[in-house]
């Protein structure tokens, strides 16, 4: 039959070449002389000349060694023709299968592999996968079947078999318990890939396994007991820095400390924060401490981490004994601002009030007093008793020193501590009005015509307060009523001055007496310029000159 079974040829053959592989034979050769030829890739097309055929015998020849990894199968066609070149057979399929030799070593896809696994994980936890390839056949032979193994582990702590590698997948897993980042933070494994399923050629690579941190170490106070001294009243004062050690990875949430005051801070006087770099607990005063109330505080502070513990761990507690140091505290006026009502104009030497301070310190310290600010110089203060007396005339109507009836004085108290301290108080004297000012007309100069004169309206002002003001009364004195009249309007706050008899042009004094509701009388002289004119005038007209 004009058929040939697939031909198997091992790669890397030694020869000699050409090497006879198989004979093509047509049974038509009994009738006529047959000539054989082959075509196809490897014969007459690239790669040309790998195979040939003996023209007359039909022997298929191999001309050189084959490489399965280059071409694993050749598909050729065999031809048979008679002497005259006519085909005597249909072209025949010739399959040449190149069989594998173990001529390649495995190759890792990387020279160094990197992976990581959390410390403390259970055996069986997968870490990473490594891969090696082998160009040889792994389907029909074991030449390309790679088996993985761990050649060595560095370091060998806690023992030399912390990891295993799946021989066929290359998956590296934890095989032993005891991965502890704080003892061994990284392992270097020398891994092997061996073909022939572990019985052939070997290649090596490195697998670096980083052990990742878990919060398996509690922060511990070192030391656990502290003594601190804090001056009383200091707010935001650094009391103590508490130091902790934590074996977990620095600057990670498993290392960063969180502090909590567990006890001893009944008045909420303290606060504790974590220093971002040193991880220390910084204990500070949130409120001022009072030596006289409590001179020692014993605080209990617990430390944990930002991250939760991965297992049950005992927490560390520190004890801080805070000694409050006595400070010479300033005397405090009671109240800090004192309002006292006092009549204006009280006699010199008259007592105004007693204004004293208390010293928070427990010792019987002597307090002395003095006036710190008395703008008008109206007051004096007894240095021992704090008695404030008038030494000048308190004038409610003094606009330079009195605002809204209040005269403000600052007083000082000084103790005899070492060094002495001072406190200030504010004395607000509310000056009660006295009818010490009579009414005053405005304006006090008028110009009026001596013919058909216009009535002159004068406003009445009184520096005192009601009821020592309107309604006002007016009266002309010193014979001024011969030529003038003075009447207060219905509201009682203006006076109307009228010329009732002819006066020649000149300047005259009008004696006007005004009294207020409390009968406080004030005599005012009005300068009246009388002009030769009719009705309304502002200035007297000059003398008329004819031409």
């Amino acid at each position: 039959d004009w058929v040939v079974a697939p031909i198997s040829v091992p790669e890397n053959g030694k020869g000699p070449f050409p090497q006879r592989l198989n004979q093509l034979k047509s049974n038509k050769d009994r009738d006529t002389k047959i000539f054989y030829s082959i075509t196809g890739p490897g014969a007459d097309s690239p790669p040309e000349g790998v195979f040939a055929v003996e023209k007359e015998t039909g022997w298929l020849l191999l001309n050189k060694p084959l490489d399965r990894e280059e071409i694993a199968k050749y598909e050729l066609f065999g031809h048979a023709v008679s002497e005259n070149g006519a085909s005597v057979e249909d072209p025949m399929n010739i399959s040449i299968i190149v069989t594998d030799q173990n001529d390649h070593k495995p190759k890792f896809t990387q020279d160094t592999f990197r992976g990581s696994v959390l410390e403390g994980v259970l055996p069986g936890t997968s870490v990473m996968q490594v891969t090696a390839t082998d160009e040889d056949d792994a389907i029909y032979t074991y030449n390309g079947v790679v088996a993985y193994s761990i050649h060595s582990q560095e370091p060998k702590d806690p023992h030399d078999l912390m990891f295993t590698i799946h021989r066929s997948t290359g998956t590296i897993s934890v095989i032993s318990s005891g991965l502890d980042r704080e003892k061994v933070p990284e392992y270097t494994l020398t891994i092997q890939a061996t073909d022939m399923d572990g019985d052939g050629s070997t290649t090596t690579a490195v697998a670096v396994v980083e052990i990742l941190d878990a919060n398996d170490n509690a922060p511990m106070f070192d030391p656990q007991k502290y003594e601190a001294h804090v001056p009383e009243n200091a707010v935001g004062h650094e009391v103590q820095r508490l130091t902790v050690t934590d074996l977990d990875a620095p600057n990670s949430p498993a290392w960063r400390a969180t502090y909590l005051i567990m006890g001893g801070d009944d008045g909420d006087h303290f606060t504790i924060t974590t220093h971002p770099e040193s991880n220390q607990g910084i204990l500070t005063t949130r409120k001022g401490l009072d030596f006289e109330a409590k001179n020692q505080h014993t605080l209990y502070v617990e430390v944990t981490n930002e991250a939760p513990f991965v297992l049950k761990l005992p927490t560390s507690t520190a004890t801080i004994v805070v000694h409050v140091e006595d400070v010479n505290e300033a005397p405090v006026f009671v109240p800090p601002s004192k309002v006292v009502e006092v009549q204006e104009g009280i006699p010199t030497g008259e007592p105004v009030c007693v204004y004293t301070a208390e010293d928070p310190d427990k010792e019987n310290q002597k307090i002395s007093y003095r006036i710190l600010r008395d703008p008008a110089g109206w007051l004096a203060m007894d240095p021992d008793s704090g008695q404030v007396t008038a030494v000048g005339t308190l004038d409610r109507e003094d606009e330079q020193f009195v605002r809204n009836n209040i005269y403000e004085v600052m007083v000082l108290a000084m103790d005899n501590g070492s060094p002495p301290t001072t406190g200030t108080g504010t004395l607000l004297l509310t000056l009660i009005d006295v009818n010490d000012h009579g009414p005053v007309p405005e304006p006090r100069q008028i110009t009026i015509c001596n013919q058909s004169p216009v009535r002159q309206v004068l406003n009445i002002t009184d520096k005192d307060l009601s009821p020592h003001t309107s309604p006002f009364q007016a009266q002309l004195t010193d014979d001024s009523d011969i030529y003038w009249t003075a009447e207060v309007n219905e509201e009682g706050d203006t006076v109307v001055l009228s010329l009732k008899k002819f006066l020649k042009q000149d300047t005259y004094d009008v004696h006007l007496s005004l009294s207020d509701h409390g009968n406080k009388e004030q005599l005012t002289v009005i300068r009246a310029t009388v002009c030769d004119c009719h009705g309304h005038v502002e200035t007297c007209p000059g003398p008329w000159k004819g031409g």
């Epitope: 990387q110 020279d111 160094t112 990197r114 990581s116 060595s152 582990q153 560095e154 370091p155 060998k156 933070p185 990284e186 270097t188 020398t190 690579a205 490195v206 670096v208 980083e210």
Partner: antibody
Framework: EVQLLESGGGLVQPGGSLRLSCAAS????????INWVRQAPGKGLEWLSV???????NYASSVKGRFTISRDNSKNTLYLQMNSLRAEDTAVYYC?????????????????WGQGTLVTVSS | DIVMTQSPDSLAVSLGERATINCKSS????????????LAWYQQKPGQPPKLLIY???TRESGVPDRFSGSGSGTDFTLTISSVQAEDVAVYYC?????????FGQGTKLEIK
């Protein structure tokens, strides 16, 4: 002060052997990986081998199977046993300390180097 | 093996001028987990051993003048000398330590113009 001092270099015939030493001082020798690096005359640097703290090793393919790195922590000394020497092995051989213990702290960078010892392979 | 290629092979720079040396790796030296580039730079003066200048591609070794700086990531890296001094005449090498075997660039010779 960290110091590394190589010795053992010299003239050797092709196929011959030589053992280089590197005496270390000024640091905790046992705590650091140590490397051998060579430099052929007028050429660049070629890394040869490392020995890690636990004694594990790694080699460049050019010397694998011919050179062996070892250390004696009790003597603070590093060694390089060189067999089957070839003309192309002629170079100045340096020992160099890794700046870190672990891969993640940069053990591949070498922060201290010895002055080197010259090995000449010639017939 | 990872191949390291430096450019240029040599360069001449005037005193006080900037010098830039490039280094290219055949594969990435960036490890994604820690975002670090496993690359170092060395200086070797005539007759002396190499001296470490930069590690992690940009971290200056203690005692190295701040005119030396490293930059780059992945496969492309640069050593810059901001103001070249006479004492900077040397051969500069980059080295990868991402993967064994560690490999160096062929070196760049710096001269004064």
């Amino acid at each position: 002060e960290v110091q590394l001092l190589e010795s053992g270099g010299g003239l050797v015939q092709p196929g011959g052997s030589l053992r280089l030493s590197c005496a270390a001082s000024g640091f905790s020798f046992s705590s650091y990986p140590i490397n051998w690096v060579r430099q052929a005359p007028g050429k660049g640097l070629e890394w040869l081998s490392v020995i890690w703290t636990g004694g594990g090793t790694n080699y460049a393919s050019s010397v694998k199977g011919r050179f062996t790195i070892s250390r004696d922590n009790s003597k603070n000394t590093l060694y390089l046993q060189m067999n089957s020497l070839r003309a192309e092995d002629t170079a100045v051989y340096y020992c160099a300390k890794s700046r870190g213990v672990y891969d993640f702290d940069g053990r591949g960078a070498m922060d201290y180097w010895g002055q080197g010892t010259l090995v000449t392979v010639s017939s | 093996d990872i191949v390291m290629t430096q450019s240029p092979d040599s360069l001449a720079v005037s005193l006080g001028e900037r010098a830039t040396i490039n280094c290219k790796s055949s594969q990435s030296l960036l490890y994604s987990s820690n975002q670090k580039n496993y690359l170092a730079w060395y200086q070797q003066k005539p007759g002396q051993p190499p001296k470490l200048l930069i590690y992690w591609a940009s971290t200056r070794e203690s005692g190295v003048p701040d005119r030396f700086s490293g930059s780059g990531s992945g496969t492309d890296f640069t050593l810059t000398i901001s103001s070249v001094q006479a004492e900077d005449v040397a051969v500069y090498y980059c080295q990868q330590y991402y993967s064994y075997p560690y490999t160096f660039g062929q070196g760049t010779k710096l001269e004064i113009k």
